[in-house]
Amino acid sequence: SERCDDWGLDTMRQIQVFEDEPARIKCPLFEHFLKFNYSTAHSAGLTLIWYWTRQDRDLEEPINFRLPENRISKEKDVLWFRPTLLNDTGNYTCMLRNTTYCSKVAFPLEVVQKDSCFNSPMKLPVHKLYIEYGIQRITCPNVDGYFPSSVKPTITWYMGCYKIQNFNNVIPEGMNLSFLIALISNNGNYTCVVTYPENGRTFHLTRTLTVKVVGSPGGGSGKPIPNPLLGLDSTGLNDIFEAQKIEWHEHHHHHH
């Protein structure tokens, strides 16, 4: 075949996804390597081709887009898994070409398993909260594009193994989790489980991030914004929170 601009294996994009969950993976060419987008390329008569190399194999092979229930499909510059399987792990290549032009890049995809407390080999994003700085929020990450705005998903938030409910200072609000006043005891891993329907099937997305409570911006105590729990000094609130956590450990261990 004619020469192709090969950007090699883009290890900066080590994509990790959970087993048995939907995954949408954009071809990195348009995001990081080329100066034009998919629509422009498509209008110019360029075709996007996908193939892959299985884990521990050298052979490049086409992706099977004829699986039952269209488990793997391509939509514009996105490769869809509905859902992933463990043996989808491998290096994926997207190639943009026509008779006179060719450019391609490969990237690794790792399908990982989670345990009953959402622990996994997944590398977790870290979200910093400022200690005692008033209301701050985290948002369930990387769920855009999985379902249209007309679909209203259900969301459950967890801290570690524990469903977040009746926490003193942490309030689930759909895709957001609000910290009324961030305390050191709020350090930990937070998981959102998003459930949504699509074409007569139900899918689940699991997203975990690490919350790190740090000193206020600019040093000092910062200036807390008005807050419904201001009447409770932070140590008192912390005592309540710790006592509740002990109670949850006794009554709701490994709550799913």
Partner: antibody, heavy 119, light 107 residues
């Protein structure tokens, strides 16, 4: 499609133990919880417990601790429930049901296994 | 344990009629509630989860609602295949607990 196939009816003596199965197909067995539910003849539903086959983590309702033991075999995608020290009140239909974290904890149910305890 | 009080325990209704069944929890269950239908000799079928979400394949005449401690299941226009026993389940906390059931029969 997702299916849970439960093993056939069991007849057991008082004091004996019985172990029955729930074979999963059509989905990734290790990614979902398996729930177990008891229904005595003419009575309502009673939750026994749950297991996450991915790591074997279990939860039981207090009443069934020591009575029911939940296990899972990943290689065969099969969940098991063992009942020990059988008594007449253990005569019932036992259902397995698949569930996920948080939102949809019961979606697909097995057809049930009938256990009869009789001397 | 959270106690789920379901009412009525049995009811008669005509085909085409609007039917409502209620479930009251002994404490706030944060919409972690499912509804099931069990027909004689069959395993239960999940209808609704998280109080108001219809399971795929369940007819749209079924709807759920409620919050806090009080929840309801409504059938907008009763059909023959809807007859059976309806159960609610709370899964807000362990142990999960079912309501005692509502037997729905033809008037």
């Amino acid at each position: 499609q997702v299916q849970l196939q439960q093993s056939g009816a069991e007849l057991a003596r008082p004091g004996a133990s019985v172990k029955f199965s729930c074979k999963a197909s059509g989905y990734t067995f290790t990614s979902y919880w398996m729930q177990w539910v008891k229904q005595r003849p003419g009575q309502g539903l009673e939750w026994i417990g749950t297991i996450y086959p991915g790591d074997g983590n279990t939860r039981y309702t207090q009443k069934f601790k020591g009575k029911a033991t939940l296990t899972a075999d990943k290689s065969s995608s099969t969940a098991y429930m063992q009942l020990s020290g059988l008594a007449s009140e253990d005569s019932a239909v036992y259902y397995c049901a698949r569930g996920y974290f948080g939102n949809l904890v019961f979606d697909v149910w097995g057809a049930g296994t009938t256990v009869t305890v009789s001397s | 344990d959270i106690k789920m009080t379901q009412s009525p325990s049995s009811m008669y209704a005509s085909l085409g009629e609007r039917v409502t069944i209620t479930c009251k929890a002994s404490q706030d269950i944060n919409t972690y509630l499912s509804w099931f239908l069990q027909k004689p000799g069959k395993s239960p079928k999940t209808l609704i989860y998280r109080a108001d979400r219809l399971v795929d394949g369940v007819p749209s005449r079924f709807s759920g609602g409620g919050s806090g401690q009080d929840y309801s299941l409504t059938i907008s226009s009763l059909e023959y295949e809807d007859l059976g026993i309806y159960y609610c389940l709370q899964y807000d906390e362990f142990p999960y607990t079912f309501g005692s059931g509502t037997k729905l029969e033809i008037k």
